[in-house]
Amino acid sequence: EDELQVIQPEKSVSVAAGESATLRCAMTSLIPVGPIMWFRGAGAGRELIYNQKEGHFPRVTTVSELTKRNNLDFSISISNITPADAGTYYCVKFRKGSPDDVEFKSGAGTELSVRAKPS
């Protein structure tokens, strides 16, 4: 069986300030079991944007129903974009662990650029 891949098809997305940005992410397998998280940036300074397992992320909606059986689409939409949202977003698969989940594989990233709101 092929190892899971995290696919972020768009290298970049450009959105006007105030609009919503859709960031696409798909998995090639349901295994290993574990949550998906989205981050802005990489390394220690990365910002948690969405955690499938816990938390309240009011500006983020999932494009498909993540709890649906056999779902492999983990795309998200971020509303009301501002210049501070610009950056590279990574879709990251975690493997279920105890006590903490372990990062398993990351997508290649999608760079979000924010255009000035048209006047």
């Epitope: 105030g18 220690a44 300074g45 990365r46 910002e47 948690l48 309240h56 501002t82 501070a84």
Partner: antibody, heavy 119, light 108 residues
Amino acid sequence: DVQLVESGGGVVRPGESLRLSCAASGFSFSSYAMNWVRQAPGEGLEWVSRINSGGGGTDYAESVKGRFTISRDNSENTLYLQMNSLRAEDTAVYYCAKQYDWNGFFDYWGLGALVTVSS
Amino acid sequence: ETVLTQSPATLSVSPGERATLSCRASQTVGSKLAWHQQKPGQAPRLLIYDASRRATGIPDRFSGSGSGTDFTLTISSLQTEDSAVYYCQQYYYWPPYRFGGGTKVEIK
């Protein structure tokens, strides 16, 4: 209910150090960025520092850069502010504040801890 | 760096009357503006976010409006317990997070 409780305030001399703590409860602490905001006697609110959800990304106001260090322990649901080389102008009530999302306003505030720097 | 200017510095209003507070940004902040209330000796409390959305548990006499650079907080029928300092906060550009200088609302 979200609760933020600061401790560690007190009276110190110029040049001395102090560490503030903020115990958080009632929300998924590890999913949210946290901030310190201060208020000098009779003055307005001044943002001091921010730390991202994972603890690896930090930002500081110019007035405290190089002297203050923000950190967090997600296993203990606690936020810290290490204050070194304290000055008279650092005298203030220090509030810890939860951020609504990674790029957002402060939706919950602690009761504050008074720090007095005086010779 | 975005500067927020609040006016007036002090507002004296009779109970039951309308209070209108202004916050002006030096550059556009879209709708990314919040209002916080601070009563004497207490911590700040979030009232309004995204310029016009009331936070949980905030009475409907508080309303926010505006976008871009000009924002207004309105207290439609002032109650004695509304005596406080009100601060606006922008979160469109950061760091740093910026607050306005505050408007003190007094009861006549």
